[in-house]
Interface confidence: medium
């Protein structure tokens, strides 16, 4: 028996044991977040299945999601949102020894979908483990990019207080307008529930001591909140490794100066 | 034996005030959420609220919102629910129920006590 | 106005089956596990059910639930007399942040 004719994208295929890997990380975050101890993960599955499967991957829209962010409905306590922009892995570093703020991928649907690549077919009820479309060269609407659209959008209309954002100073663009941070998020901060957004620049070099504050795209980032009624600060990072430490440990007499 | 054991209840003016206690036993009271849940004469159940296992995170319904406060005493296994301000409509018995977590899964409600009766 | 709706009354003859419903929304009987609740005459409620369709130790396997997609529903099967109680479903609400109940179906055995 030949196989089937399969579309053929340039991205890499879904990843492996997707299914199980979803359900169980539903299951391991209900045990350990007991807020959201009654979520019924099966149907968490579900929703998240019937957003992409048998859909044209290149066809994926928020609405598709909506069933599953509406199971997913959870809140974040005002000033304790944390937003990123091309420093992942620090800022999970930081929720993890700051256990009351929250990224994204803090949260149940950022947490089942973290590292994840998935899609389907068009009037199958296959996934796709060949290849996934990829969002430069095939389509932006694909599962994965509406996904982390969707749930950004949420994420953001639901910040209160002041919101804070950790943005990569050693990037070229330390405030890029295409990020999911540029693109989506700061668009649906809402004026009337957020007070302020803090960013926080994130040095790379150890002998760096610019005012990384300054930087135009900075200034780009301030012109943009501040003309939607949002107060802007700014912070420099200049030793992430010191900052992480005193996050632990604040008491330590050398995290009396700055960082 | 797990056991609750509530107390407290009785007659009461309307804008007066009150507090339940519920006494648990035989189980490890620190670790478990505890719910109030109330049963006006005839009617149904109605959730109260709920309080977590160390006492920093409080939830509760609409009804009792501000008038109504849940709270523990993990050193003498005991759960409270004040209330002030009370109303004919909260006339009800009041149960205090646990919420179990057991091989990592929950249980809701799974141990009831046999209830207080609460006259305005 | 309760937030899941049940039928309030149900009847059946011993050994018969009989089955009750509830009825809700995408945010809580969709989202969550759903527990059911036997009350007998002048008692304290009891868990009959708890994650949809599991059945707490000593709770005799004529008792059932099941759940697809914003209903479920609770089954008796081989109805006996000492059945005869009130039933509530209940389950979290993720919108209103409050554990929600059905209004009560009484259960009568003819």
């Known amino acids: 028996v030949l196989p089937r004719w399969r579309q053929q994208w340039s991205g890499s295929g879904t990843t492996s044991r997707f299914p199980e890997t979803v359900l169980a990380r539903c299951v391991k975050y209900t045990e350990v977040h007991p807020e959201m101890r009654h979520v019924d993960c099966q149907s968490v599955w579900d929703a998240f299945k019937g957003a992409f499967i048998s859909k044209y991957p290149c066809n994926i829209t928020e609405e598709d999601y909506q069933p599953l962010v509406k199971l997913g409905t959870q809140t974040v306590p005002c000033n304790k949102t944390l937003l990123w922009s091309r420093i992942k892995d620090l800022a999970h570093q930081f929720t993890q020894v700051q256990r009351d703020m929250f990224t994204l991928e803090d949260m149940l649907l950022g947490y089942l979908a973290d590292d994840l690549t998935w899609c389907g077919e068009f009037n199958t009820f296959e996934i796709n483990y060949q290849s996934c479309p990829d969002w430069r060269k095939d389509c932006s609407n694909n599962p994965v990019s509406v996904f982390w659209k969707t749930v950004s959008r949420r994420f953001a209309e639901t910040a209160c207080g002041v919101v804070h954002v950790m943005l990569n100073g050693s990037r070229s663009k330390i405030f890029d307008k295409n990020s999911t941070f540029g693109s989506v998020e700061v668009h649906n901060l809402q004026p009337e529930k957020v007070q302020a957004l803090e960013a926080w620049v994130i040095h790379g070099g150890r002998e760096d001591s610019r005012d990384l504050c300054q930087d135009p795209t900075i200034k780009e980032l301030e012109s943009i909140i501040s003309k939607r009624n949002i107060r802007f600060f700014c912070k420099n990072i200049y030793r992430p490794d010191k900052f992480l430490q005193c996050v632990k440990n604040p008491e330590d007499s050398s995290c009396l100066s700055g960082i | 034996e797990v056991q609750l054991l509530e107390s407290g209840g009785g007659f009461v003016q309307p804008g007066g005030s009150l507090r339940l206690s519920c006494a648990a036993s035989?189980?490890?009271?620190?670790?478990?959420?505890m719910n109030w849940v109330r049963q006006a004469p005839g009617k149904g159940l109605e959730w109260v609220g709920i309080i977590n296992g160390d006492g920093t995170n409080t939830y509760y319904a609409d009804s009792v919102k501000g008038r109504f406060t849940i709270s523990r005493d993990n050193s003498k296994n005991t759960l409270y629910l004040q209330m002030s301000s009370l109303r004919a409509e909260d006339t009800a018995i009041y149960y205090c129920?646990?919420?179990?977590?057991?091989?990592?899964?929950?249980?809701?409600?799974?141990?009831w006590g046999q209830g207080t009766t609460v006259t305005v | 106005q309760s937030v899941l709706t049940q039928p309030s009354s149900a009847s059946g003859t011993p050994g018969q089956r009989v089955t009750i419903s509830c009825s809700g929304g995408?945010?809580?009987?969709?989202?969550?596990?759903v527990y059911w609740y036997q009350q007998l005459p002048g008692t304290a409620p009891k868990l009959l059910i708890y994650?949809?369709?599991q059945r707490p130790s000593g709770v005799p396997d004529r008792f059932s639930g099941s759940k697809s997609g914003t209903s479920a529903s609770l089954a008796i099967s081989g109805l006996q007399s000492e059945d005869e109680a009130d039933y509530y479903c209940g389950t979290w609400d993720n919108i209103l942040n409050v554990w929600v109940f059905g209004g009560g179906t009484k259960l009568t055995v003819l």
């Open positions: 994650r949809n369709s």
């Open positions: 035989g189980f490890n009271f620190n670790n478990a959420w």
């Open positions: 995408s945010s809580n009987i969709h989202a969550n596990y």
């Open positions: 129920a646990r919420d179990n977590k057991l091989n990592d899964y929950y249980y809701a409600m799974d141990v």
